[in-house]
C-alpha cells in the first residue's frame, strides 16, 4: 500500500505568460497544496502539453469556466 | 486553503423566502466554480445550483429551477443564495462549496465546503 504522506506533489514555480486559446486545452487541475509556493492551474492541451497558469488571471477563469461546461455536455 | 463562513438560515413558514449567503476568505474567490448543496435528514447530499467564476453562467437542479437564484460578489468574496416560494421539502442543511477541480455539479469536484446552515420551513 503506497504512503499517502510522501506522494510526490506536483508544483508550479512559473506561469506561462501566454494565453492559450480554449481551441487547444483538453482539462485542467487545480495546485492547491500547501506544500507548493504559489497556488496554480495546470492546463492540458489538446497534445497533451502541460502548461501552467495563474488562477488570478481574468483568460485563466475564463478557460476554466469553458472546460468545466464541457463537462455537463455529453461527448459524441 | 479556502474558508467558507455562512448566513441566513433559518426557521420560514412555506410559501416564503430566505437569503443564504457564503463569504469565502484565503484564496483568489472569483477563480472557483462555486455551488450550493443541501442534505436533508436521512437523505443523501443533493446539488442545489452552481454559478461560474465569472458569474456568466447559472445552473441549477431540477426541483429549484424558477424558485432559486444563485450569485456572487467577486469583489466581496461572497456567493448567495435567494430563496422563494420554499416548501416544506426544501427543509435541509444548505452547504456551500467551492469548486476547484474540472467539472459541474459533481460534489467530488468541490475542494472545500462551508459547515452548513439550517433551513426549516414549516406548512
Known amino acids: 500500500q503506497p504512503d499517502a504522506i510522501n506522494a510526490p506533489v506536483t508544483c508550479c514555480y512559473n506561469f506561462t505568460n501566454r494565453k492559450i486559446s480554449v481551441q487547444r486545452l483538453a482539462s485542467y487541475r487545480r495546485i492547491t497544496s500547501s506544500k507548493c509556493p504559489k497556488e496554480a492551474v495546470i492546463f492540458k492541451t489538446i497534445v497533451a502539453k502541460e502548461i501552467c497558469a495563474d488562477p488570478k488571471q481574468k483568460w485563466v477563469q475564463d478557460s476554466m469556466d469553458h472546460l468545466d461546461k464541457q463537462t455537463q455536455t455529453p461527448k459524441t | 486553503e479556502v474558508q467558507l463562513v455562512k448566513s441566513g438560515g433559518g426557521l420560514v413558514q412555506a410559501g416564503g423566502s430566505l437569503r443564504l449567503s457564503c463569504a469565502a476568505s484565503g484564496r483568489t474567490f472569483s477563480s472557483y466554480r462555486m455551488g450550493w448543496f443541501r442534505q436533508a435528514p436521512e437523505k443523501e447530499r443533493e446539488f442545489v445550483a452552481l454559478i461560474s467564476r465569472s458569474g456568466g453562467t447559472t445552473f441549477y437542479s431540477n426541483s429549484v429551477k424558477g424558485r432559486f437564484t444563485i450569485s456572487r460578489d467577486n469583489a466581496k468574496n461572497t456567493v448567495y443564495l435567494q430563496m422563494n416560494s420554499l416548501e416544506p421539502e426544501d427543509t435541509a442543511v444548505y452547504y456551500c462549496?467551492?469548486?476547484?477541480?474540472?467539472?459541474?455539479?459533481?460534489?467530488?469536484?468541490?475542494?472545500?465546503w462551508g459547515q452548513g446552515t439550517q433551513v426549516t420551513v414549516s406548512s
Open positions: 462549496a467551492a469548486g476547484a477541480q474540472m467539472g459541474w455539479a459533481e460534489a467530488s469536484t468541490y475542494d472545500y
